[in-house]
Structures are given as C-alpha cells and as structure tokens.
C-alpha cells in the first residue's frame, strides 16, 4: 500500500559534501546526504541509512518520500515543516525506522499528504495529536487518505501504563481530523478489543485491516456508519462467533467484502445464526475455508457444511444436580 517510485534514474548525493553545505541555506533541489533522489519520479529515498533525524534539506519537488529502515527514535512537532513547505509531499513511508515516539503536530505543514506508513515502529508514545496537529476539539481536516499502522505495538515492557488500543484510537479520533480517511491498516498490533467509538467517527473508510490481532468479539463494535466500507480484514484473530447484530450490519453494507480466515470458531449452539448467514451471504471471501476449532469433536469441520443438529451446547445443570 505504500508508494513505489518509477524506474527513473536516481542521483545520490556525496556524503562528504554534507558538512560543507549544512552551514549554508540548502540549495532548492539538492539531494540530502545519504539519500537518492529522482526529480523525474518526484521521489526521495533515504533507506536503511541509520538516519537519526529527518533530513532538513529535502528537495521541494518531493512527492514520494521513503525514510524506511532508519533510527529516528522520535518524530518531533513539525518534523517535515520547511520554508517553503513541502507542498507536493503526498506519500510518506517511515516504516521500520525505530520510532518509539511521535509527537503532536509531527506531520503539520504537509498540505498534500495523502499516504502515511508508520508500520513496524514500536510506538510506545503516539501523541493523541500526532495526526490532527492541535488539541482543538475540531481540528482542520487532515488530507490523509491512507494511514498504515501495521505492527506498531511496542514490546510489553516498553508500553506505557495505559491501553495501547486506547492510545491509537485517541490519535485516530483527535479533532475529528481524519474524517476523509479511506484506508486504515491496524494489522498485527495485539489488539484485544476495538473501542466502540472509533468506527463511528471515520465515516469515509473504504478499507479496514484488523488482521492478525487478538480480537475475541465484535459484540460492541458497530459498522453501521461505515456505509461504503469495501474490505474488512479480520483474518488471524481470536474470534469465536459473530452474533446477529454484527451479521445484520455487515449484510447491510452493499459494497463490503469480509475476510474471516484463521479464527478459532466455536461450533456450538451460539454458532447457528452465523452458519445460516454464511450459507446465504455473498460478502464473505473464501467462506468455504472457514472451519471449527472448538469443541474438540467439531475441530476442522467446515462451517458451511454444518446443520443445526451439529450445533449443540452442553446443558447447564441446575446447582442442585451439579456434583463437586
């Protein structure tokens, strides 16, 4: 989902020039030290260079900026603010750059920024105002259309004393700045739950990727506001069953495709509605691959092949009949 440049020729700047130039104002379209630049492709790549900060002398023409595989650690406020501003910058990839803190207003003064990838950074401290830029209750709309936040969960010992889910959601909702967001990827973040208010405030979402998390239930999550959602990736979670309310909401979204592979479906009496729905719906991709994980006697049975007689629950004995 991140931008790739065209195969135009890249010019590399000579590292030994960096110190000589740094004291002077940057030339308008020079290439920063340790980067490769292609004006034709409007692309700058500063990849796997162990950079500890964002280069100050980025060329004004840059539309696609790759700062992957570095050691940035902290992204301060106005990390990309320049005079004149980087008015053309549309796609920014910061994945795998050892970022553990993104401060308020880190992406301010990027009026054309449509695509942002912060994946594979251990974000222990993501400011609530990282994307909105201000603590106003309603901020200026962000131009972001795609936000890629896959595998940004820090190691457990580096997490703050707060919910990681809550920290991420606070950044997504602050100032209602991300109302225009169309793609949100939150895969591989050990999410145990999805805060119920997050989806209601992202009405433009077309693609939502929650795959490879630890979601157990969607009972309190509403998809109703995501009227034009096209893909919902829930593969590789810990889902046991989808209940009627969720099924009805998904069925009511006319453009949706739902991806449910590799969840530990529990095939007991509570699964009956979901099985009935699966047999009728067209919205689930690869529905014939969904299999039971529990109970043991049902393991590997295909959900589509089950009937109501297969889906029973062990009766709960009244206390007087229970034995110790």
């Amino acid at each position: 989902s991140s931008p790739t440049s065209s195969a135009s020729s890249f010019s590399s700047s000579a590292p030994f020039l960096a110190s000589a130039v740094s004291a002077q104002p940057p030339l308008p379209d020079q290439c920063p030290a340790l980067c490769e630049c292609s004006e034709a492709a409007r692309t700058v790549k500063c990849v796997n260079r162990n950079l500890t900060e964002v280069p100050t002398d980025l060329p004004a023409y840059v539309r696609n900026l790759f700062l992957t595989g570095n050691q940035l650690a902290v992204l301060p406020a106005g990390a990309f603010a320049r005079r004149p501003p980087l008015a053309e910058l549309a796609a920014l990839n910061l994945s795998g750059s050892r970022l553990d803190e993104v401060r308020a207003g880190a992406f301010e003064h990027l009026p054309s920024l449509r695509q942002l990838d912060l994946s594979h950074n251990p974000l222990a401290d993501l400011s609530p105002f990282a994307f909105s830029g201000s603590n106003a209750s309603v901020s200026a709309p962000s131009p972001l259309v795609e936000l890629i936040l896959n595998h940004i969960v820090p190691p457990e010992d580096e997490r703050q004393n707060r919910s990681f889910e809550g920290m991420v959601v606070a950044a997504l909702l602050a100032g209602r700045a991300l109302q225009g967001l169309r793609r949100l990827e939150l895969a591989s973040n050990h999410f145990l739950y999805l805060p119920r208010d997050v989806l209601a405030q992202l009405p433009s979402l077309r693609h939502l990727d929650l795959s490879n998390n630890s979601l157990v239930s969607l009972t309190y999550v509403s998809f109703r506001n995501l009227t034009h959602l096209e893909s919902l990736h829930l593969e590789d979670n810990a889902l046991k069953v989808l209940h009627n309310g969720t099924l009805a909401e998904l069925q009511g979204l006319p453009h949706i495709r739902v991806f449910l592979d590799n969840n530990p479906w529990v095939c007991d009496c509570h699964m009956a509605d979901m099985v009935t729905w699966l047999k009728e719906t067209e919205v689930v991709q690869g529905k014939d691959r969904l299999t039971c994980a529990y109970p043991e006697k049902m393991r590997n049975r295909v959900l589509l092949e089950l009937n109501s007689a297969d889906l029973d629950c062990d009766p709960i004995l009244p206390p007087s009949l229970q034995t110790s």
Partner: antibody, heavy 115, light 107 residues
C-alpha cells in the same frame, strides 16, 4: 486522482463477442470495485455488473447474465468486460466506473453491432 | 429490481436560479442514493453519494437530501458550466439501477 482509460471503439457483427478493457491509474486511492455501465444511443444508464478486483468476486445484472463476463488482472490494474452473442440492441457506449458509489468513470467505449 | 423515477425529464433555468430535481425509488433504499453529472463527450462525474455527501472536488452549490424512497438534488445557484444531464442511482440493492435522467438547459 484516479483515472480510467478504456480501449477504443469496436465494430462487431451480430453473434460476435466484444472484450473491452479499462486500465486504472492513480491506483493508491482507487477502489477495489470496478463497475460496468451501458448507455444505448439517446438512452439512460444501465448497470451491467461489477468485480471486486482483489479476489475476482462478481455481481451481474440479470438482464446481461449469461452473456457478460467481467474479469480483472491485478498485475496490470486492468479490468475487462466481455459481452457475447451480440445483437443490434447492444450498440451502445460502455463505461467502466471505479468505486462502490462509482466515484470515477472512464471515457466510454462505443460498440457498434451491425451486419 | 428497484425502479428509479426521476423528474422532470428536462428543465430550463437561468444562471443564478435554484434548481431542484427529484428521484423516487420503488422501495426503501435507506440513504444509498447517488447523483451523477454527464456532459456530452466527457466522463460521467459523481457529485453526491449516500444522499447528501459531497464527492471530493465538487462545488458546495450542489447538495442532496431525502431518505427511504424520496430524494432531492439541488443546485443552489445555477452556473453556465452546470448545463448537463443529471442521473440518480441507487446502490442499496443489487442490481444497481439509475433514474432516466434530467436534461438541464439554460434559459
């Protein structure tokens, strides 16, 4: 901005098959759904069908079912609409339209069916 | 299939006028109603989706309202470049269906 570029005009004989292409550029923000719409001369718009490009899932309008096949090649970001057993009333401009709500449209491809 | 009935089929108005077009669905389509603009020889443009949401880059003089079966499209102050044919379309229930179109002309 998403742009859709369709293949050129076609002239076909009754009973023949036509295959129209639609190439997507500006892909980063394009939709997974590609729709096809027919507009006969002096007439309104009629939805033919759609494809979800990532997994090939299709929906068709019953009026065209059995004669139309919609496919997509994700490696080239191109969608195709093939209409078989052509008859004179299939003479029309055919549009591809990207998005659930058909956000962006191609310029149209005129197909003329004439003996 | 859901029938979409659009009225009027043509209308003539002056620059600066407020113009309204109606669209009625043969059954409830919630808010899944879109409006498109078609100019001769140009690509069709989405103006409004989900009854009232303005598509990106569309001027704010265009608006939409309604729900269920009855919908309205409004141009608050007609401009010369608005001369076109306008279509409504439902995307609530397959197959998607369009209204017959409204041809808008300048007086």
């Amino acid at each position: 901005e998403v742009q859709l570029v369709q293949s050129g005009a076609e002239v076909k004989k009754p009973g023949a098959t036509v295959k129209i292409s639609c190439k997507v550029s500006g892909y980063a923000f394009s939709s997974s759904w590609m729709n096809w719409v027919q507009q006969a001369p002096g007439k309104g718009l009629e939805w033919i069908g759609r494809i979800y490009r990532e997994d090939g899932h299709t929906n068709y309008n019953g009026k065209f079912k059995g004669r139309v096949t919609i496919t997509a090649d994700t490696s080239t970001d191109t969608a195709y609409m093939e209409l078989s057993s052509l008859r004179s009333e299939d003479t029309a401009v055919y549009f591809c339209a990207n998005g659930g709500a058909m956000d962006y449209w191609g310029q149209g491809t005129l197909v003329t069916v004439s003996s | 299939d859901i029938q979409m009935t659009q009225s009027p089929s043509s209308l003539s108005a002056s620059v600066g006028d407020r113009v309204t077009i109606s669209c009625r669905a043969s059954q409830d389509i919630s808010n899944y109603l879109n409006w498109y603009q078609q100019k001769p020889g140009k690509a069709v443009k989405l103006l409004i989706y989900y009854t009232s949401r303005l598509h990106s880059g569309v001027p704010s003089r265009f608006s939409g309202s309604g729900s269920g079966t009855d919908f309205t499209f409004t141009i608050s102050s007609l401009q010369p470049e608005d001369i076109a044919t306008y279509f409504c379309q439902q995307d609530n229930t397959l197959p998607w269906t369009f209204g017959g179109g409204t041809k808008l002309e300048i007086k």
